[in-house]
Interface confidence: low
């Protein structure tokens, strides 16, 4: 397993609708045709997998139907969007990139993006 550099923003604030987007960029040492991107969430020293997608270079990035993530790829950049976030989901979201094919296998793990989620205040009833 060979190491690879992965860059991602340090901090992102989710929108009032609970959507957070960030770019995950990897320094590809070779011409990979198959790439796997995994988003991990680290909170209270526990790491859980949020979502994962395997895609062919040049094709759309397709997350599974059960996933809260969507994304697009462009060259060595992956634009990730996580939906349905609530305040309790605030945490460090780590981008892990694997170059699956062809060999050799490369693995890169970013330093993480701290996503802050603030639940919107409920709107007061109004008489319009």
């Amino acid at each position: 397993c060979k190491a690879m550099h992965v860059a991602q923003p340090a901090v992102v604030l989710a929108s009032s609708r609970g959507i957070a987007s960030f770019v995950c960029e990897y320094a590809s040492p070779g011409k990979a045709t198959e790439v796997r991107v995994t988003v991990l969430r680290q909170a209270d020293s526990q790491v859980t997998e949020v979502c994962a997608a395997t895609y062919m270079m040049g094709n759309e990035l397709t997350f599974l139907d059960d996933s809260i993530c969507t994304g697009t790829s462009s060259g060595n950049q992956v634009n990730l969007t996580i939906q349905g976030l609530r305040a309790m989901d605030t945490g460090l979201y780590i981008c892990k990139v694997e170059l699956m094919y062809p060999p050799p296998y490369y693995l890169g793990i970013g330093n993480g993006t701290q996503i802050y989620v603030i639940d919107p205040e409920p709107c007061p009833d109004s008489d319009f």
């Epitope: 997608a53 895609y55 139907d65």
Partner: antibody
Framework: EVQLVQSGAELKKPGASVKMSCKAS????????MDWVRQAHGKGLEWIGN????????SYNQKFKGRATLTVDKSSSTAYMELRSLRSDDTAVYYC?????????????WGQGTLVTVSS | EIVLTQSPATLSLSPGERATLSCSAS?????MHWFQQKPGKAPKLWIY???ILASGVPARFSGSGSGTDYTLTISRLEAEDFATYYC?????????FGQGTKLEIK
Amino acid sequence: EVQLVQSGAELKKPGASVKMSCKASGYTFTDYNMDWVRQAHGKGLEWIGNINPNSESTSYNQKFKGRATLTVDKSSSTAYMELRSLRSDDTAVYYCTRDGNRYDAWFAYWGQGTLVTVSS
Amino acid sequence: EIVLTQSPATLSLSPGERATLSCSASSSVTYMHWFQQKPGKAPKLWIYSTSILASGVPARFSGSGSGTDYTLTISRLEAEDFATYYCQQRTSYPLTFGQGTKLEIK
């Protein structure tokens, strides 16, 4: 009515290859990924991989990477799976099954299965 | 890879009894999906997205759970319910199935 009709049983020798088909009808073939799942006799279900008939992009279970190849023929709405370097433990029923999307349940439609027997 | 462990492997009950089938995931999954399979037949989607009954599935079936622990429950067993049930996750590749729970007549 959605239907997936698979090719007939195959008897192969160890080291050989097998290519099976899955003909889809009753829906737009390019709108849904096609997955392949196998089941050895008396055993559980094992996912092999899937293919997007539109882009022809594939995702494989690493266990089958390099041995299985998924392809499609859009003109005939048919998906194919080839498995190479067959071993006795590849003896199983191989199913094609249709992915879903945000509005349709995944794996709601299955082919009848293709029995592959690997024996010398 | 997310490993799904089903328990028990075999469940022997009589018609009219309540059945509880469990599926435990090695890491958190978004939803669990369940399939019913009878000998010599292809699997049938039975419950999807944890708790939604597939078309034609009787209301005596229900699904629940979250995170790593999920359950399929049959409130009152009928003869046609005796089969093997598999859980499945589609949260991350590779898609994986549990090893199955065989529900047999006592």
